[in-house]
C-alpha cells in the first residue's frame, strides 16, 4: 500500500458505502467448465471459448451472435457431455435458495439450429443431461421425465406428483435447505443407464403462511403458503427408486424400482442424507435418524436377471456419535475406487478431528490415511494412484485452505501442492479438476488479491496464471484500505481464533470502535483468510471502526471437543463467547470499551440478540437481522440436529431457556436495531415478530425496519441497498460518529 | 453383440398348441422388452404381444384369450405359448427387441406350418 | 387400433432413382412411426425411428419425415441393394401396428 503511515498526510480516498452498494471495485473471477480431461469453456466478451489446458490455445466453441434471433434473455447454459448439444435456460423465476424454475430450448451444435419439436415445458423446475451423451432428465410439475434424444418425445417416470404434496426428483422446502443443498433429487449412473430418484411426500407437513404483498395495485395480498416442518413437527416422509431409462416406452409405463431405508431407520423418522453412484450398477445410500447421531450406508447392487437392486446387510456402514451429531452438517459422501469395491471417506477419528478414512466395501471398520490437530475440509479427486483434499493443516491455521495430494500405495507420501505457490498473497485455495483430475485450476480467495492458476496434475508444476486480479490492485493502490488480522487467543487451554478487519494507519496506541460481527452458528468459520470487499470494508476504511469476528465454540474445522460443546445447548457457549472475546478485544489496548457493537444475521441475528440481551454491560448497541428468536419456530432438520426435540422427554426446558423474549428485560441497556423481510420463507418474520412483541410488552424502546416482500437475503437491488445505509446510520449514530 | 434367436417345432398340429422359445445375448432381458411378431406367407408383418423388462405383458385383443408369453431372466430365454392352432396361424414368428419405442434387433424367424 | 395405410403397394424402378414412399395413419400419431425393410427370407431391420432419425449403419440416402398423420420415407439415390419391401409402424399405442408394406422392384 503506498501512502505513509499518517493517515493525515493519505490524500487517498477511502473504501466508501457507495464503493460497497456500487460494487465499483470488483473482483475478478475465472470461472471454467471441463468438458473433458484437457479442455474447458470459458465465456469471455459472451463468446464460449474452449480452452486447450495444456497449451492454452483456444477456440470460440459458440459465439455472441449464435443466439441474437433467440428473443430470450439465456440465463445459463449447459453442454452436453458428449459436445453436440447446448441446452438454454431463460424465463428464469427465483423460489427458494436454490430452487428456481425456467424455461428451456436445445440447440443442436452439429446442425447449427435449434429443436423445434418435442421442446420442454415452460416451468420446469430441473433438468440434467446424463453425465455421458446427451440424454436429459427433467422435472415438471413435480414429476419427472426423461428424454433419450432431445427431438424425441418425453418418457414419464412418476405420475404421482402434486404441488406441496408429493415431489419426484426434487425437493421439498426443508431437504432444500437442510439436506441436499440443491432442488434436485435426481442421480444419473455414470454412464446414464439408471436413474436414481428420490419423492418426498409432505402431505402431513405444517405449513407456513405469510402475506406477500406484492404491487401496490394488489388489493389484497397474497398468501404463500410453503410446507415447513418446524422442530418438534412432523417431518416429511422419503421413498428412492431407480429406473432404468433403456427400458422406456411410450405404450407401458416407466418401471420404477424402489430401495427401502435399512430397517434400522424405518423403525422411526429418517432421512435420505447422500445419494452416490460406485459404479455403473452400484449405488450407495446414506440414511440419518431424525435423531441425527446415527447414520446406515447402505451399498446397492442390481441384480439383473430380477431387475432389482439388493442392500447386503453385511455391507452396511454405520456411523455414529456420541458427543454430537454425524457430519458437519449432515454424513460425508464417499469417494469410490473405480471397481467400486472401496472408498474414501471424511468422518470424525477418536480424538475428534475429521480425517480421511478408508473403508472397503466388505469390513466394518475402516483406516485413517491422515492424522492430526486439524481438519481434512474436502476430498476434491480420486485417481488410481493419488487423493487429493482440502486440509487447514497448514501452519495450524483453521482459517486457511490448502490442496494436498496422498499417495494411495504410501499413506505416508503427502505433498501440500498449494502452500509455498505464494505464500504471503494466497493461504486460502479452493480447486476444480479436470475430469479424470489430469489438470487443475486452483483459485486462491486470499489473504491477497484472488489468483487463478492453472496446474498439471502429472508434475504439479503451474501451466498459466488466469486472472491475477493486476487491474484491481492497481485501482486499489489508490485506496485507504483496511489491513487484516488474523490471531487467536487463548481461554481455558484452548485457542479460539479471530479476525479484525483495522482501519488504514491503524496505531495501537490510539482508541477505535469496535463493532463484532458475529455469525457462530454449528461448524461455523468466520476468521479467516479470505480476502472480501464488504461492508465492513467501508467501516474500516471510511469509518475507522475495527470490525471483529471471533470463532468460539461451537465453531467448525478445528476439532469436535470445540464443534459439538454447544450439542443440545444452542444459545449458551457460543453467545458467551462472544461476549467474552469483546472483553479480550478491548484489554488490547486499542478499543474503544464505550464503543463496542455487535451485529449478525441469521444465526448471527439470534446470537446478536442474545449478547445484547444477556446484560453483560459490554455492548453499547447492535443490530439483529432475520434472527432466530426461539428455536421451536425454524425448521425440523437444522434445529433437531443440535438441539434434539421440543418433548419434556427430550429436551424441551433447554428449548424454552434459550429464546430472545426471556431476555426482553435486558435490552433496555443497550440500543438495539431489528431487521427482518417479511416474505423470509427461512427464518419466518414470526420470529422477530415475537421479539418484537416481548420488547413491546416490557417497555423497551427500539428500532426496527421491516422489508416488505423480502426473503432471507434481504438481496433485491434496493433493498440491499437500503439496508446497508440504515445500518451503517445505525452504526455512526451508536459511535457518535459525524 | 445383440442375437435373438427362435427355436420352434417347425410343424404343429390344428387345435394344438405353439411353444416357442427365445434365446437372447448380448442384452438382458430385465431391461428390454421382447415383442413377438408374426408374417404370414406372402403377407405383411403382424404384431402379437411383448413382454416387458419389469414382466409386465401386453397382448393384441385378438390374441388374448390364446396367447401367453413368460420369461427366465437367468437363462435369457423368452417363451411364447399360442394354443388352438388353425390353418391361417402358418407364418414365420419373429422374437423382436424393443429399443424404446421401435424394433432395433429382430430374429431369424422361425416358420410354423399348422397342418395335419 | 390404429390403421397404416401404405402407398403404393408396389413401385418398379431403376438404380439412382428418387423413391417416395407415403405412409397414412388412420388418426394423429405425432412422430411415433418407424420404417423397415425387409429383403426376402429375411427379418426386417430398423431404418427410420422417430418418423425422422436414422438408425445406426443406415446409409444417409434414407431419409424420414411427417407427423401427425401422414409420413413419408424417401430413398434419395436407389442403389441396387435397396430392393426390398419396406414397412412403416406405428409406437404411440397398444396394439403396434404395421402398415400393409411397398415393395420396391427393379424396372
Known amino acids: 500500500n503506498k501512502g505513509t503511515d499518517d493517515a493525515t498526510a493519505d490524500s487517498r480516498k477511502t473504501y466508501t458505502l457507495t464503493d460497497y452498494l456500487k460494487n465499483t471495485y470488483r473482483l475478478k473471477l475465472y470461472s471454467l467448465r471441463w468438458i473433458s480431461d484437457h479442455e474447458y469453456l470459458y465465456k469471455q466478451e459472451n463468446n464460449i471459448l474452449v480452452f486447450n489446458a495444456e497449451y492454452g490455445n483456444s477456440s470460440v466453441f459458440l459465439e455472441n451472435s449464435t443466439f441474437d434471433e433467440f428473443g430470450h434473455s439465456i440465463n445459463d447454459y449447459s453442454i452436453s457431455p458428449d459436445g453436440q448439444f447446448i441446452l438454454l435456460e431463460y424465463n428464469y423465476v427465483k423460489q427458494w435458495r436454490h430452487s428456481y424454475t425456467a424455461s428451456y430450448d436445445i440447440y443442436d451444435l452439429n446442425k447449427r439450429q435449434l429443436i423445434t419439436e418435442e421442446r420442454i415445458p415452460n416451468n420446469t423446475q430441473w433438468v440434467t443431461w446424463s453425465p455421458v451423451g446427451h440424454k436429459l432428465a427433467y422435472v415438471w410439475n413435480n414429476d419427472i421425465y426423461v428424454k433419450i434424444e432431445p427431438n424425441l418425445p418425453s418418457y414419464r417416470i412418476t405420475w404421482t406428483g402434486k404441488e406441496d404434496i408429493i415431489y419426484n426428483g426434487i425437493t421439498d422446502w426443508v431437504y432444500e435447505e437442510e439436506v441436499f443443498s440443491a432442488y434436485s433429487a435426481l442421480w444419473w449412473s455414470p454412464n446414464g443407464t439408471f436413474l436414481a430418484y428420490a419423492q418426498f411426500n409432505d402431505t402431513e407437513v405444517p405449513l407456513i403462511e405469510y402475506s406477500f404483498y406484492s404491487d401496490e395495485s394488489l388489493q389484497y395480498p397474497k398468501t404463500v403458503r410453503v410446507p415447513y416442518p418446524k422442530a418438534g413437527a412432523v417431518n416429511p416422509t422419503v421413498k428412492f427408486f431407480v429406473v432404468n431409462t433403456d427400458s422406456l416406452s411410450s405404450v407401458t409405463n416407466a418401471t420404477s424400482i424402489q430401495i427401502t431405508a435399512p430397517a434400522s431407520m424405518l423403525i422411526g423418522d429418517h432421512y435420505l442424507c447422500d445419494v452416490t453412484w460406485a459404479t455403473q450398477e452400484r449405488i450407495s445410500l446414506q440414511w440419518l435418524r431424525r435423531i441425527q447421531n446415527y447414520s446406515v450406508m447402505d451399498i446397492c447392487d442390481y441384480d439383473e436377471s430380477s431387475g432389482r437392486w439388493n442392500c447386503l446387510v453385511a455391507r452396511q456402514h454405520i456411523e455414529m456419535s456420541t458427543t454430537g451429531w454425524v457430519g458437519r452438517f449432515r454424513p460425508s459422501e464417499p469417494h469410490f475406487t473405480l471397481d467400486g469395491n472401496s472408498f474414501y471417506k471424511i468422518i470424525s477419528n477418536e480424538e475428534g478431528y475429521r480425517h480421511i478414512c478408508y473403508f472397503q466395501i466388505d469390513k466394518k471398520d475402516c483406516t485413517f490415511i491422515t492424522k492430526g490437530t486439524w481438519e481434512v475440509i474436502g476430498i476434491e479427486a480420486l485417481t488410481s494412484d493419488y487423493l487429493y483434499y482440502i486440509s487447514n493443516e497448514y501452519k495450524g491455521m483453521p482459517g486457511g485452505r490448502n490442496l494436498y495430494k496422498i499417495q494411495l500405495s504410501d499413506y505416508t507420501k503427502v505433498t501440500c501442492l498449494s502452500c509455498e505457490l505464494n505464500p504471503e498473497r494466497c493461504q486460502y485455495y479452493s480447486v476444480s479438476f479436470s475430469k479424470e483430475a489430469k489438470y487443475y485450476q486452483l483459485r486462491c480467495s486470499g489473504p491477497g488479491l484472488p489468483l487463478y492458476t492453472l496446474h498439471s496434475s502429472v508434475n504439479d508444476k503451474g501451466l498459466r496464471v488466469l486472472e491475477d486480479n493486476s487491474a484491481l490492485d492497481k485501482m486499489l493502490q489508490n485506496v485507504q484500505m483496511p489491513s487484516k488480522k488474523l490471531d487467536f487467543i487463548i481461554l481455558n487451554e484452548t485457542k479460539f481464533w479471530y479476525q479484525m478487519i483495522l482501519p488504514p494507519h491503524f496505531d495501537k496506541s490510539k482508541k477505535y470502535p469496535l463493532l463484532l460481527d458475529v455469525y457462530a452458528g454449528p461448524c461455523s468459520q468466520k476468521a479467516d483468510t479470505v480476502f472480501r470487499l464488504n461492508w465492513a470494508t467501508y467501516l474500516a476504511s471510511t469509518e475507522n471502526i475495527i470490525v471483529a469476528s471471533f470463532d468460539g465454540r461451537g465453531s467448525g474445522y478445528q476439532g469436535d471437543k470445540i464443534m459439538h460443546a454447544i450439542n443440545r445447548r444452542l444459545g449458551t457457549f457460543e453467545v458467551e463467547d462472544q461476549i467474552e472475546a469483546a472483553r479480550q478485544f478491548s484489554k488490547m489496548g486499542f478499543v474503544d470499551n464505550k464503543r463496542i457493537a455487535i451485529w449478525g444475521w441469521s444465526y448471527g441475528g439470534y446470537v446478536t440478540s442474545m449478547v445484547l440481551g444477556s446484560g453483560s454491560g459490554v455492548f453499547k448497541c447492535g443490530i439483529a437481522v432475520a434472527p432466530v428468536s426461539r428455536w421451536e419456530y425454524y425448521d425440523s432438520v437444522y434445529t433437531e440436529r443440535y438441539m434434539g426435540l421440543p418433548t419434556p422427554e427430550d429436551n424441551l426446558d433447554h428449548y424454552r431457556n434459550s429464546t430472545v423474549m426471556s431476555r426482553a428485560e435486558n435490552f433496555k441497556q443497550v440500543e438495539y436495531l431489528l431487521i427482518h423481510g417479511t416474505a423470509d420463507d427461512n427464518v419466518h418474520f414470526q420470529q422477530s415478530a415475537q421479539i418484537s412483541k416481548a420488547l413491546v410488552d416490557v417497555g423497551v424502546d427500539f428500532q426496527a425496519m421491516w422489508y416488505t416482500d423480502e426473503d432471507h437475503g434481504i438481496a433485491s437491488s434496493t433493498a440491499h441497498q437500503h439496508i446497508y445505509t440504515h445500518m451503517s446510520h445505525f452504526i455512526k449514530q451508536c459511535f457518535s460518529l459525524p | 453383440q445383440v442375437k435373438l434367436q427362435e427355436s420352434g417345432p417347425g410343424l404343429v398340429q390344428p387345435s394344438q398348441t405353439l411353444s416357442i422359445t427365445c434365446t437372447v445375448s448380448g442384452f438382458s432381458l430385465t431391461t428390454y422388452g421382447v415383442h413377438w411378431v408374426r408374417q404370414s406367407p406372402g403377407k405383411g408383418l403382424e404384431w402379437l404381444g411383448v413382454i416387458w423388462g419389469g414382466g409386465r405383458t401386453d397382448y393384441d385383443a385378438a390374441f388374448i384369450s390364446r396367447l401367453s408369453i413368460s420369461k427366465d431372466n437367468s437363462k435369457s430365454q423368452v417363451f411364447f405359448k399360442m394354443n388352438s392352432l388353425q390353418a391361417n396361424d402358418t407364418a414365420i414368428y419373429y422374437c423382436?427387441?424393443?429399443?424404446?419405442?421401435?424394433?432395433?434387433?429382430w430374429g431369424q424367424g422361425t416358420t410354423v406350418t399348422v397342418s395335419s | 387400433e390404429i390403421e397404416l395405410t401404405q402407398s403404393p403397394s408396389s413401385l418398379s424402378v431403376s438404380p439412382g432413382d428418387r423413391v417416395t414412399i407415403s405412409c397414412s395413419a388412420s388418426q394423429g400419431i405425432r412422430n411415433s412411426l418407424n420404417w423397415y425393410q425387409q429383403k426376402p427370407g429375411q427379418a426386417p431391420r430398423l431404418l427410420i425411428y422417430?418418423?425422422?432419425n436414422l438408425h445406426t449403419g443406415v446409409p444417409a440416402r434414407f431419409s424420414g419425415s411427417g407427423s401427425g398423420t401422414d409420413f413419408t420415407l424417401t430413398i434419395s439415390r436407389l442403389q441396387a441393394e435397396d430392393f426390398a419391401t419396406y414397412y412403416c409402424?406405428?409406437?404411440?399405442?397398444?396394439?403396434?401396428?404395421f402398415g400393409s408394406g411397398t415393395k420396391v422392384e427393379i424396372k
Open positions: 423382436v427387441r424393443n429399443r424404446h419405442d421401435w424394433f432395433d434387433y
Open positions: 422417430y418418423s425422422s
Open positions: 409402424q406405428q409406437s404411440i399405442k397398444l396394439p403396434l401396428t
